[in-house]
């Protein structure tokens, strides 16, 4: 999916008002220095591509985050503010959601969500030069 035509400011507002809090809740009890940020993004569409991938694509050690509250809210925000997102993306992520039996917070998932927090922070500061 091409995130170029999303309403970035509206997505940012949704992140600041609610998604960020859910990410913090998920990470509660974890030191902010525990994980190094290894995933980066260069602009807002790229950041959303990486956020979409990390949030909804299963990875080794972290089967799926799609049932988490922050993931459901991310999906809702993208559905509302990115034209055509629902039609191209939702069915795939819905299927993943159904395949997941229960929520298990592994260390790998915590690391993945830590990466997500970094990507969202980068998304919110699009004018910063890439380190």
């Amino acid at each position: 999916y091409d995130f170029t035509n999303c309403d970035f400011e509206k997505i940012k507002a949704a992140y600041l008002s609610t998604i960020s809090k859910d990410l913090i809740t998920y990470m509660s009890g974890t030191k902010s220095t525990e994980f190094n940020n290894t995933v980066s993004c260069s602009n807002r569409p790229h950041c959303l591509t990486e956020i979409q991938s990390l949030t909804f694509n299963p990875t080794a050690g972290c089967a799926s985050l799609a049932k988490e509250m922050f993931a459901m809210k991310t999906k809702a925000a993208l559905a509302i503010w990115c034209p055509g997102y629902s039609e191209t993306q939702i069915n795939a992520t819905q299927a993943m959601k159904k395949a997941r039996k229960s929520k298990v917070t592994t260390n790998k998932c915590l690391e993945q969500v830590s990466q997500l927090q970094g990507l969202w922070r980068r998304f919110n500061r699009p004018l910063l030069k890439q380190q």
Epitope: A14, A76, I80, I90
Partner: antibody, heavy 120, light 111 residues
Framework: QVQLVQSGAEVKKPGSSVKVSCKAS????????INWVRQAPGQGLEWLGV????????IYAEKFQGRVTITADTSTSTAYMELSSLRSEDTAVYYC?????????????WGQGTLVTVSS | QSALTQPPSASGSPGQSVTISCTGT?????????VSWYQQHPGKAPKLMIY???KRPSGVPDRFSGSKSGNTASLTVSGLQAEDEADYYC???????????FGGGTKLTVL
């Protein structure tokens, strides 16, 4: 039972406000969109706006911007639509309608409607 | 945004097919595959018949079908039955995050 139940009919004076409620049951209220649509006597359907409680997003039709306020109370699974500065042309049946999960623009469940009459 | 354009009336005999058109612009029907159709009987709330241009919710007979070409969407009711007599409204998502841009409605009469 999956349903939307709306508050009763209202008679209002021009210039006043009306607040219509819509109580949801039988589904996860927050995940869906709650849209508001009205129908003047003998006329077609007109969309006023939507709220998606999950992310606290409200979007209003341009025509009603500044005059309509849509809110939701997730603890009671109830959505509200308030329309201010009422005029006779606002006389209509007001419906709440559920927007499908993540496809909030398809209205797959409707309330029974609330008749709002604006008359001096 | 202007309402989508529908013919005010359509009719057909039992068993026949009827097609109702709905014309918009590239900012609504032509720009998104987000067209839906609603059936409304007198004094009742509307009912979703078609969504996503051509998908049918469970419980809606397969006599109802939808399609789209350019800026025009169509609802076809085949094998007309007496209970199909109702008002039909098309709706489309429109640019500017309008979730429900409706047509003026078409009164379908079964002769």
């Amino acid at each position: 039972q999956v349903q939307l139940v709306q508050s009763g009919a209202e008679v209002k004076k021009p210039g006043s406000s009306v607040k219509v409620s819509c109580k949801a049951s039988g589904f996860t209220f927050g995940s869906y969109g709650i849209n508001w649509v009205r129908q003047a006597p003998g006329q077609g359907l007109e969309w006023l706006g939507v709220i998606v409680p999950l992310v606290g997003v409200t979007i209003y039709a341009e025509k009603f911007q500044g005059r309509v306020t849509i809110t939701a109370d997730t603890s009671t699974s109830t959505a509200y639509m308030e329309l201010s500065s009422l005029r006779s042309e606002d006389t209509a049946v007001y419906y709440c309608a559920r927007g499908q999960e993540y496809f909030y623009w398809y209205f797959d469940l409707w309330g029974q409607g609330t008749l709002v009459t604006v008359s001096s | 945004q202007s309402a989508l354009t529908q013919p005010p009336s359509a009719s057909g005999s039992p068993g026949q097919s009827v097609t109702i058109s709905c014309t918009g612009t590239s900012s609504d029907i032509g720009g998104y595959d987000r067209v839906s159709w609603y059936q409304q009987h007198p004094g009742k709330a509307p009912k979703l018949m078609i969504y996503g241009v051509s998908k049918r919710p469970s419980g809606v007979p397969d006599r109802f079908s939808g399609s789209k070409s350019g800026n025009t969407a169509s609802l076809t009711v085949s094998g007309l039955q007496a209970e199909d007599e109702a008002d039909y409204y098309c709706s489309s998502y429109a640019s500017g995050h309008t979730f429900g841009l409706f047509g003026g409605g078409t009164k379908l009469t079964v002769l």
